[in-house]
Amino acid sequence: SITGISPITEYLASLSTYNDQSITFALEDESYEIYVEDLKKDEKKDKVLLSYYESQHPSNESGDGVDGKMLMVTLSPTKDFWLHANNKEHSVELHKCEKPLPDQAFFVLHNMHSNCVSFECKTDPGVFIGVKDNHLALIKVDSSENLCTENILFKLSET
């Protein structure tokens, strides 16, 4: 369960792929589309508000039933819109919604690298946000060896 309804911190950052393509958001026909693209040299990067939440993780090992904490994040590129995992369609979508946010808007934050993060679906463990055909998609990672595959690694930058 997520500890408290307030994030422990919030962080405004641009999101890019391991290969330095930018994640951008465009309003089209009253809904937002998500793109993965190369930006021109001085083109401004879109920012995303990452809200960090603590989540207790139940344990088989420790006596008090709690083994440790995970960091969950929500990602919001614009007011009232959040990235959502659509597990049926294996897609990542932007949905307008009110708080409390649904579980589909929460992602477990992983550091696979000192400077890269990955986002695992809260609703579907082992499934991560990834890049497929210049779009964001949900990608199943079947073993720990594949956790370092470049298409699920993202960089966060304040600039």
Epitope: Y11, E61, G68, K69, L109, N111, C148
Partner: antibody, heavy 122, light 107 residues
Framework: EVQLVESGGGLVQPGGSLRLSCAAS????????MTWVRQAPGKGLEWVAS????????YYPDSVKGRFTISRDNAKNSLYLQMNSLRAEDTAVYYC???????????????WGQGTLVTVSS | DIQMTQSPSSLSASVGDRVTITCLAS??????LAWYQQKPGKSPKLLIY???RLQDGVPSRFSGSGSGTDFTLTISSLQPEDFATYFC?????????FGGGTKVEIK
């Protein structure tokens, strides 16, 4: 109860090698980044090495890069630090530490071992 | 590398005093800033993480604040068991770096 127990410290000559071990218990070891931090006598804390929870990534400061190697055996709940080409300035208490969150480096080090002393001297 | 400059390096205070220790970073970063307490011959103990979050089991007289480059640890009413050395640490960018420490002594 989380426990981290270091071993393998001792007296070694300059240029020599030493392998430190850290036995972890009381938590799901393979879900956490692990880090070695050292403290020279009467001095501050210095980061030495970190390893991802899978073991696939390792990170070092310039002061030990190329000489020290961090590794882990998730099946044995153990963390290691192989130290080669030791110098007098590597003399310190070496602490094994665990990250605060699963899968992640954020949030400092809530758990530390008791430390093991490494003395590099001729 | 991000340099963490702690001040003061030492201070003398009495039981009941309000004590403030600052940590200045050479460049700004997200709030992945931790504070530790260390007593002679003991391992460091995490007090504060995420700049202002109190670690489980740490008394509420300890608090942290700040963002960007300026961070502060405050002990609202110093207790006898608080005489120790305090370190800040940034975890936002590698290499991870610690402040030089602040020794809190009895006046």
């Amino acid at each position: 109860e989380v426990q981290l127990v270091e071993s393998g410290g001792g007296l070694v000559q300059p240029g020599g090698s030493l392998r430190l071990s850290c036995a972890a218990s009381g938590f799901t070891f393979n879900n956490y980044w692990m880090t070695w931090v050292r403290q020279a006598p009467g001095k501050g804390l210095e980061w030495v090495a970190s390893i991802t929870y899978t073991g696939g990534g390792t990170y070092y400061p310039d002061s030990v890069k190329g000489r020290f190697t961090i590794s882990r055996d998730n099946a044995k709940n153990s963390l290691y630090l192989q130290m080669n080409s030791l110098r007098a300035e590597d003399t310190a208490v070496y602490y094994c530490t665990r990250a605060n969150y699963y899968y992640n480096t954020y949030g400092g080090f809530p758990y530390w071992g008791q430390g093991t002393l490494v003395t590099v001297s001729s | 590398d991000i340099q963490m400059t702690q001040s003061p390096s030492s201070l003398s205070a009495s039981v009941g005093d309000r004590v403030t220790i600052t940590c200045l970073a050479s460049e700004g970063f997200s709030n992945d800033l931790a504070w530790y307490q260390q007593k002679p011959g003991k391992s460091p103990k995490l007090l504060i993480y995420a700049a202002s979050r109190l670690q489980d089991g740490v008394p509420s007289r300890f608090s942290g604040s700040g963002s960007g480059t300026d961070f502060t640890l405050t002990i609202s009413s110093l207790q006898p068991e608080d005489f120790a050395t305090y370190f800040c640490q940034q975890g936002s960018k590698y290499p991870l770096t610690f402040g030089g420490g602040t020794k809190v002594e009895i006046k």
